[in-house]
Amino acid sequence: LIIGFGISGKHFITVTTFTSAGNIGEDGTLSCTFEPDIKLNGIVIQWLKEGIKGLVHEFKEGKDDLSQQHEMFRGRTAVFADQVVVGNASLRLKNVQLTDAGTYTCYIRTSKGKGNANLEYKTGAFSMPEINVDYNASSESLRCEAPRWFPQPTVAWASQVDQGANFSEVSNTSFELNSENVTMKVVSVLYNVTINNTYSCMIENDIAKATGDIKVTDSEVKRRSQLQLLNSG
């Protein structure tokens, strides 16, 4: 969370940004809020990126002004016009690229004053893992798969019964490059699993942490997975 203040004469407005992460190939949001202003035609929103000449996006007099937009962002940005009224200057970024990572500035001007705040935008790939029982193996094993990760993550297994146990000796993890030659498919197999136990497959890089849980009993298999972005908020 970054809060910036701007001063214009006696007036300053608070601008707040949230560090966020973009999943390459998907759409992302760079979050920014400001003190709402009743005079809508005086609201100017500018998004800038460190090291880039020109603007990422500009919204003024009620519409987008893309005359100074840098070509790497052409056709990929939008603000949520109906949210500007309530002080939301967040930027939608389509088809996130690895090169979109960096420091962005959300600059706001209203009839009350001006202000800005910076935002660190990380890019990578992250996806939810799915764990399945691998019945083909000679001994009962679990297979944890996640289709897209970048940078290369670490993978660790944990068990509810054997808490603190190190499963690296009884697991095998592989990373397979996807067709676009950036992201990788993560596959990890855990061997010698026991029934009536809950196992967790944890995949983590510097952008996200994902966990898949599986509980295997005689009668059923229960699965749960979650994904958490790191250093966000």
Partner: antibody
Framework: QVQLVQSGAEVKKPGSSMRVSCKAS????????ISWVRQAPGQGLEWMGG????????NYAQKFQGRVTITADKSTSTAYMELSSLRSEDTAVYYC?????????WGQGTLVTVSS | EIVMTQSPASLSVSPGERATLSCRAS??????LAWYQQKPGQAPRLLIY???TRATGIPARVSGGGSGTEFTLTISSLQSEDFAVYYC?????????FGPGTKLEIK
């Protein structure tokens, strides 16, 4: 001097529609949103929705979604609020106001009575 | 939606005294809160926006405070024209929502 002038009082039958107009100054229309707020007899204020002609956006409260339509005619600087499928609970004073996010000038109000 | 509550529902105060009205939001609205005064048969009048900024023409004896979920409107040295109903309104998120009002009466 900012002024919002609304159309006159109406009596409507249940099931019918109502349409209230709100004439504003040109500056108000080009620079601000126009919202609609209603007040049932002896009750509090209830935001129905609003339009920001400069942004080309309109938002409605969930409660009225599908039953209310807010439009803006830039050429005459007039906003309209239409409410369909009227019922007795819609009897209220309907106000137009300059804003959101907050409302600094209000129309005089239009009393709409829904009765059979 | 964000639910606004106000307390007390009614308040009896003598002229010349101070009145403090409270408004609570069901979730944080930062400082995105406005206060209105309404007299019988009249449209509401904006008093405060941004939780603490007085609207044009509002006297200094009217002040607003608070942020997040708890807000107050204080009127010091009450005058006859101050007796009315007061509403708070959040504008952090759509839909904009009002509190049920506090009726300020002469004691």
């Amino acid at each position: 001097q900012v002024q919002l002038v609304q159309s006159g009082a109406e009596v409507k039958k249940p099931g019918s529609s109502m349409r209230v107009s709100c004439k504003a100054s040109e500056d108000t229309f080009s620079s601000y949103a126009i919202s609609w707020v209603r007040q049932a007899p002896g009750q509090g204020l209830e935001w129905m929705g609003g339009t920001a002609p400069i942004f080309g956006t309109t938002n409605y409260a969930q409660k009225f979604q599908g039953r209310v339509t807010i439009t803006a005619d830039k050429s005459t600087s007039t906003a309209y609020m239409e409410l369909s499928s009227l019922r007795s609970e819609d009897t209220a004073v309907y106000y137009c106001a300059r804003g959101g996010p907050y409302f600094d000038y209000w129309g005089q109000g239009t009393l709409v009575t829904v009765s059979s | 939606e964000i639910v606004m509550t106000q307390s007390p529902a009614s308040l009896s105060v003598s002229p010349g005294e101070r009145a403090t009205l409270s408004c609570r939001a069901s979730q944080s609205v930062s400082s995105n809160l406005a206060w209105y005064q309404q007299k019988p048969g009249q449209a509401p009048r904006l008093l405060i926006y941004g939780a603490s900024t007085r609207a044009t023409g509002i006297p200094a004896r009217v002040s607003g405070g608070g942020s997040g979920t708890e807000f107050t409107l204080t009127i010091s040295s009450l005058q006859s024209e101050d007796f009315a109903v007061y509403y708070c309104q959040q504008y952090k998120n759509w839909p904009f929502t009002f509190g049920p009002g506090t009726k300020l009466e002469i004691k």
